[in-house]
């Protein structure tokens, strides 16, 4: 149990106040983290509060400003990037968001040696992506879907690709579906370690069906947004990978990297690229039916000037119980011999663990094991491997950082973070300098987040980078809710839940219950992290109990739970929320006439299905930007879990699992349906179809749309949204305003 101090001593009670909705909407209690921008083994950059770019040397203890806020302000820069030779800085301004990761910007190059901006051969605008080579100061950038290379910032650009076309051919940047569902980046180009080669992906969307929606703006006529967006079963992008020698790019030209034969025989995806050395690269491919992944190691043949990917260097990863990997197929972390690597995949017991692959996957040496999961490999040095897992004290929603000594035999394991600030910190990530000489730990909770700097050899804490003192002081007179993380054992399934309880919670009283659900495959909601958010307010001020439950399909508890939902989304996720609610009622402090459920995106889908389950458990519920039919969602995501919507595959369950099919069942609940009209991700179409089905069934419901808003419902829409949902819930629970 994690109990947040509620400080209810009588002497203090009159100075304490509950959280208000305004607190949440204003971000009054938001926290800060500190991630060093490492530039060497012992140096990092950080943007100071007054916007200077400061270089810190850990070993000398010195710091100096490399770029003044005056220079930053002169071009309205909001971001920067130092070239590895430390001669130049790019300054980024005019940020313009596109999709989840992608944005365009204007870039200026500042010469640190003479304190002036580089004039002549300036960069075009707006640029879709720009990055320095890992060594020196070569620049690669993407402009109008084509890739350009500059040997030096003041040089003219060399155009590498010529076929880039808006919504048709994407070079060096992903199309919509690859950005959102496969790469999770705004870029699709990768420098080799010393900058000799540049690898890039080309995505051909020519044959992909287009989603079109109106953007109302404030002109007389709305404009139409067109996005090539493959829905389940539709034609997918065609991907090719090229590598070009950046020293003399005009001569050999781009070399296409061959696709493994077993992958190329049918529709496939490229999933990631990892450089090993300047002359060795590792590509990962995935069949469209995403249970087979191939990792292919390719070598540059100097005499032929080509990339050779021998079959002996193809490593196959296959799942017989679900899809390959977790949310994504894991990426390899290569060891110093530049051929063997460490990778997370399922062991024979169905838990994701670190394995060491030297020759074949069949001969992999398992490095971690147990009924818990290794989650991320941060760094491999010559003598240590740093990773995170949820092993400690058997809480799946925790993250601790471990070090395994790989230089000694047998390897020894040490938990770096488990006992550092045990009550405050149970959920960590880390950021390592070159050769793991130093690292930063960022603790996200359950207490107030704190970022610290550590010696990579001894693990000794060197200094606190950010401890959120202002936040700590601001919370001193706030009645925060209590939080507890526990588990339910039901029919051989473990359901972990987080319960957020009102500050003066009394087990003998009855409280309204709100279930907050996400529930998507490989997600996790029950995490030991700090948050002061809308549900904190609902517990603190409105006296609600809020519960989050991780049911079947969720992550980091083994494949049995994770793959339970394979090919049948919308069944067990909903069942498990309902089961948990029944268990919560049995606890005696829930008013069973006042139970609600709400969720966003996948959570909107689950909350809708739960409301329409016919159990009579829920009085009301909210779905924000829900999926309503898997036929409407992206191919890469949907097919990973559901297969194809074809008669000979899984069409039947595609049809059975829609929200529309259950329209009649909404008759006895209060339903609030919310969606942004410019949602590029879960299209407004989803809610339009729910609304149509409810109207056709003559079922009353409430709805709110947000004009020109995307899947995030940001800006002023956020305030309106949470205010609106608060009113809806208070009305449902008969709470006075």
């Amino acid at each position: 149990i994690v109990l947040r101090p509620s400080r209810v001593h009588n002497s203090e009670e009159n100075t304490m106040r509950a959280l208000t909705l305004k607190d949440i909407l204003n971000g009054t209690f938001s926290y800060k983290t500190f991630f060093p921008n490492w530039i060497s083994g012992q140096e990092y950059l950080h943007q100071s509060a007054d916007n200077n770019i400061v270089l810190y040397n850990i070993e000398t203890g010195q710091s100096y400003t490399i770029l003044s806020n005056r220079t930053m302000k002169s071009v309205n820069a909001s971001n920067y990037g130092l070239s590895p030779d430390r001669q130049f800085v790019y300054l980024e301004s005019d940020y313009s968001k596109l999709w989840r990761y992608s944005y365009t910007a204007t870039y200026y190059i500042y010469d640190l040696s003479n304190g002036e901006f580089v004039r002549g051969n300036e960069l075009p605008r707006p640029i879709q992506y720009l990055c320095w080579s890992p060594v020196g100061s070569k620049l690669a950038y993407v402009y109008q879907n084509n890739i350009y290379l500059k040997q030096r910032p003041g040089d003219p650009p060399f155009q590498i690709t010529f076929n880039g076309r808006e919504n048709k051919i994407f070079n060096g940047i992903p199309d919509w579906v690859y950005e959102e569902e496969m790469l999770a980046t705004k870029y699709a180009l990768w420098w080799s370690p010393n900058g000799k080669f540049l690898a890039y992906a080309e995505f051909n969307d020519t044959d992909i069906p287009v989603i079109a929606y109106s953007y109302y703006g404030d002109e007389q006529y709305p404009r139409t947004i067109n996005i090539p967006y493959p829905k389940a079963g539709a034609k997918n992008p065609v991907v090719r990978i090229f590598i070009i020698d950046t020293t003399y790019p005009a001569y050999v030209g781009p070399q296409e990297v061959p696709v493994p034969a077993m992958i190329a025989s049918s529709d496939y995806y490229f999933s990631w690229l990892t450089w090993v050395t300047d002359e060795r690269v590792c590509l990962q491919w995935l069949k469209r039916v995403q249970n087979v992944s191939v990792l292919s190691i390719c070598d540059f043949r100097e005499d032929w000037q080509t990339w050779d990917c021998p079959k002996t260097q193809e490593h196959i990863e296959e799942s017989r119980t679900g899809w390959a990997g977790g949310f994504f197929v894991s990426t390899p972390v290569f060891s110093y011999d530049a051929i063997s690597y460490y990778k997370i995949f399922s062991d024979k017991d169905g838990y994701k663990h670190i394995h060491y692959i030297k020759d074949t996957v069949e001969n992999a040496i398992q490095i971690t094991s147990g009924k818990w999961e290794a989650i991320n490999i941060f760094r491999v040095t010559q003598d240590s491997l740093f990773y995170s897992s949820n092993e400690f004290e058997e809480y799946p929603g925790r993250r601790n950082i471990y070090r395994i000594s790989i230089g000694s035999y047998p390897p020894s394991k040490k938990c770096v973070t488990c006992h550092l600030r045990k009550e405050r910190c149970q959920y960590y990530t880390a950021s390592f300098s070159d050769y793991a000489k130093y690292y930063a730990l960022v603790c996200y909770g359950p207490g107030i987040p704190i970022s610290t700097l550590h010696d990579g050899r001894t693990d000794q804490e060197i200094k606190i980078l950010e401890e959120n003192k202002e936040l700590e002081n601001a919370l001193k007179n706030i009645q925060l809710p209590k939080e507890e993380i526990k588990k339910l054992e039901v029919d051989e399934i473990t359901l972990w839940y987080k319960m957020i309880l009102p500050p003066q919670f009394d087990r003998s009283k009855k409280y309204p219950l709100l279930i907050q659900v996400y529930g998507g495959p490989c997600s996790q909601s029950v995490r030991s992290v700090f948050a002061v958010n809308w549900i904190s307010y609902l517990a603190s001020k409105e006296g609600m109990v809020i519960a989050l439950v991780d049911g079947r399909g969720t992550a980091f508890q083994g494949d049995k739970l994770l793959y339970a939902v394979y090919r049948k989304l919308g069944v067990y996720e909903v069942e498990d929320q309902i089961t948990a609610v029944r268990k919560f009622i049995e606890m005696g402090f829930i008013d069973e006439k006042r139970i609600a459920i709400w969720g966003w995106s996948y959570g909107g889908y689950v909350s809708s299905l739960a409301l329409a389950s016919g159990t009579g458990l829920f009085k009301c519920g909210i779905a924000v930007a829900p999926v309503s039919s898997w036929e409407y969602y992206a191919s890469v995501y949907t097919e990973r879990f559901m297969g194809l919507p074809t008669k000979d595959d899984n069409l039947e369950h595609y049809k059975n699992s829609t929200v529309m099919a259950r329209a009649e069942y909404f008759r006895n609940v209060d339903y609030l349906l919310i969606h942004g009209t410019a949602d590029d991700n879960v299209h407004f179409q989803n809610s339009a179809q729910i609304a149509k089905a409810l109207v056709n069934a003559q079922v009353d419901f409430q709805a709110m749309w947000y004009s020109d808003q995307n899947h995030g419902l940001s800006g002023l829409s956020t305030n309106h949204l949470y205010t609106h949902m608060t009113h809806f819930l208070k009305q449902c629970f008969s709470l006075s305003d």
């Epitope: 650009p157 020293t247 781009p254």
Partner: antibody
């Protein structure tokens, strides 16, 4: 040693078609980008078209775009240039050259294409 | 497209003399993308200076390339009888690759 041998040139009427071939030997043909460069009688050199090693990307001068098609058969170590809708100004010696946009380090001896009525 | 202008059009020199050929680009090119070729009557061009001012395989060291930005030079330190030919510069930084109109080096 590296050899590039063009063939397929000749006399053709305006509007007609020709297919040039370039047989390569002495190097790993399938590893290199290849180009066609032409030279009108008594004039300078003009780059015409290029193709990357896999054949997956092609490039053309504006003067021939839509009329000429470059291709290759790596199994036969041969580069091709299909020329359609030929014009008098296409008259030239056509060279195949090893390279993409520059540093053409090996050239064939050339094949003459004459477009005349 | 980038226009390359070579000068002089013709250079009349005696064997043993130094030849300096100029190539000026209409926009910045840099030496990484500039090459020089030699062509003799009835023959195919031959690469002399590869992109990046590197001498091509088998080219004698009397040939050297220099320059940056828009101005480039091919220097033949001591002309040999076999060096009398037409010389072309070529840029490969921008599509389409373009050649200069050529400089003819003839025996005086």
């Amino acid at each position: 040693e590296v050899q590039l041998l063009e063939s397929g040139g000749g006399l053709v009427q305006p509007g007609g078609s020709l297919r040039l071939s370039c047989a390569a030997s002495g190097f790993t043909f399938s590893s290199y980008a290849m180009s066609w460069v032409r030279q009108a009688p008594g004039k300078g050199l003009e780059w015409v078209s290029a193709i990357i090693s896999s054949g997956g990307l092609t490039y053309y001068a504006d003067s021939v775009k839509g009329r000429f098609t470059i291709s290759r058969d790596n199994s036969k170590n041969t580069l091709y240039l299909q020329m359609n809708s030929l014009r008098a100004e296409d008259t030239a010696v056509y060279y195949c050259a090893k390279g993409w946009f520059g540093g053409f380090n090996y050239w064939g001896q050339g094949t003459l294409v004459t477009v005349s009525s | 497209e980038i226009v390359l202008t070579q000068s002089p059009g013709t250079l009349s020199l005696s064997p043993g003399e130094r030849a300096t050929l100029s190539c000026r680009a209409s926009q910045s090119v840099t030496s990484s993308y500039l090459a020089w070729y030699q062509q003799k009557p009835g023959q195919a061009p031959r690469l002399l200076i590869n992109v990046g001012s590197r001498r091509a395989t088998g080219i004698p060291d009397r040939f050297s390339g220099s320059g940056s930005g828009t101005d480039f030079t091919l220097t033949i330190s001591r002309l040999e009888p076999e060096d009398f030919a037409v010389y072309y510069c070529q840029q490969g930084i921008m599509l389409p690759p373009t050649f200069g109109q050529g400089t003819k080096v003839e025996i005086k």
